[in-house]
């Protein structure tokens, strides 16, 4: 592939992470070309042999493909010549972790970036009242978590207090013996009052808020990706 | 939101030359392709050039070289095309267009540029 | 220079009817092709981009096909807005070109 005198194009990617058994993107964008057929994509990974994906000529070329990505990649094809070179990487597993590379060669130049790929699992709490209890309870569940994260319970009203005190925290494998469950209840609730249940590792971050009135209760839950 | 906004209609006598603007703006300037491209009156359109003002790299249409000069100011997120030696054949309606997220999928309003004696 | 031929050059139909534009490469694009919508006195509009990807606004009455050399745009059914004069282009390679267009009338 000639690019005698031609420069080194930027190639740009985004530290990203994969929730287990669902799909996830490597990001990576490059200085486009305006012609689909001056476009090359190759992503590998570092202590594999073979390649992750391939793309050139307008076509997937998986004739090098590591038989670990087998059926599980693709690239947005009608993005490419916009220079979104990112992958799609099907039915995520904690094996896909590691370091990748997105290399780019167009008639314009070449490049690459590497990117820190982490995998692990991650989903939104649900906080419900807990009725069943002899005092008032909340109740704060998360389906699937890896690895294993911290849970921490904080209040409006008592800012800065520690409730692990009055706070049962328990982790419940799930049937794929690799995720788990996580289940935390904080006791002796107050009326009017916003609680907050933190659940983190070191992939993601996430937030479910519950604000329990006489007459109303509110939900509110958030996650956040770290480092990405 | 993206606009293109294309400099103000031309009449030129032939041999002489003319330069035509496109100001961009709502989109990241230096980091998308613009195109040229041309339509005599009552015709198709015709693909003349682009540059990329990240780094000023060009490419022609073979049949455009020596005829059109484009070039990108980022300063003003303009860019220009000239053409020279005009000729009757030239007289055409000149837009420029830009590949944001798709091909082509902003234009400007088109600059017509009549070359007559 | 890969040469886009479009198919018919005039179609006339009714508001309702069915409308099957066809672009033809010479050489194999991949699905590197976009098809756009022009009306008198104004720029072209972008419908389709790679081949079969609706653009963003554009009704779902518009759909677009193929790959390789045989490319198809599709109007399931003739709104009175949609008479007008349509492109195919490939972005395959330089230079880029386009199809000499097929003109939509109402019958």
């Known amino acids: 592939f000639g690019i005698s005198g031609k420069h080194f194009i930027t190639v740009t990617t985004f530290t990203s992470a994969g929730n287990i058994g669902e799909d996830g993107t490597l990001s990576c964008t490059f200085e486009p070309d305006i012609k689909l057929n001056g476009i090359v994509i190759q992503w590998l990974k570092e202590g594999i042999k073979g390649l992750v994906h391939e793309f050139k000529e307008g076509k997937d070329d998986l004739s090098q493909q590591h038989e670990m990505f087998r059926g599980r990649t693709a690239v947005f094809a009608d993005q490419v010549v916009v220079g979104n070179a990112s992958l799609r990487l099907k039915n995520v597993q904690l094996t896909d972790a590691g370091t990748y590379t997105c290399y780019i060669r167009t008639s314009k130049g070449k490049g690459n970036a590497n990117l820190e790929y982490k995998t692990g699992a991650f989903s939104m709490p649900e906080i419900n009242v807990d009725y069943n209890a002899s005092s008032e309870s909340l109740r704060c569940e998360a389906p699937r978590w890896f690895p294993q994260p911290t849970v921490a319970w904080a209040s409006q009203v008592d800012q800065g207090a520690n409730f692990s005190e009055v706070s049962n925290t328990s982790f419940e494998l799930n049937s794929e013996n690799v995720t788990m469950k996580v289940v935390s209840v904080l006791y002796n609730v107050t009326i009017n009052n916003t609680y907050s249940c933190m659940i983190e590792n070191d992939i993601a971050k996430a937030t479910g808020d519950i604000k329990v009135t006489d007459s109303e209760v509110k939900r509110r839950s958030q996650l956040q990706l770290l480092n990405s | 939101q993206v606009q293109l906004v294309q400099s103000g209609a031309e009449v030129k006598k032939p041999g002489a030359s003319v330069k035509v603007s496109c100001k961009a703006s709502?989109?990241?300037?230096?980091?998308?392709?613009m195109h040229w491209v041309r339509q005599a009156p009552g015709q198709g359109l015709e693909w003349i050039a682009a540059i990329y003002p990240g780094n000023s790299d060009t490419d022609y249409n073979q049949k455009f070289k020596g005829k059109a000069k484009i070039t990108a100011v980022t300063s003003t997120s303009t860019v220009y095309m000239e053409l020279s030696s005009l000729r009757s054949e030239d007289t055409a309606v000149y837009y420029c267009?830009?590949?944001?997220?798709?091909?082509?999928?902003?234009w400007g309003q088109g600059t017509m540029v009549t070359v007559s004696s | 220079e890969i040469v886009m031929t479009q198919s018919p050059a005039t179609l006339s139909l009714s508001p309702g009817e069915r409308a099957t534009l066809t672009c033809k490469a010479s050489?194999?694009?991949?699905?590197?092709v976009a098809w756009y919508q022009q009306k008198p006195g104004q720029a072209p509009k972008l419908l389709i981009s790679?081949?079969?990807y609706r653009y963003t606004g554009v009704p779902d009455r518009f759909s677009g096909s193929g790959s390789g050399t045989d490319f198809t745009l599709t109007i399931s059914s003739l709104e009175p807005e949609d008479f007008a004069v349509y492109y195919c282009?490939?972005?395959?390679?330089?230079?880029?070109?386009f199809g000499g267009g097929t003109k939509v009338e109402i019958k």
């Open positions: 790679s081949a079969s």
């Open positions: 267009t830009t590949t944001v997220a798709h091909y082509f999928d902003y």
């Open positions: 050489q194999d694009v991949s699905f590197a």
């Open positions: 282009q490939q972005h395959y390679n330089t230079p880029l070109t």
């Open positions: 709502g989109y990241t300037f230096t980091s998308y392709w």
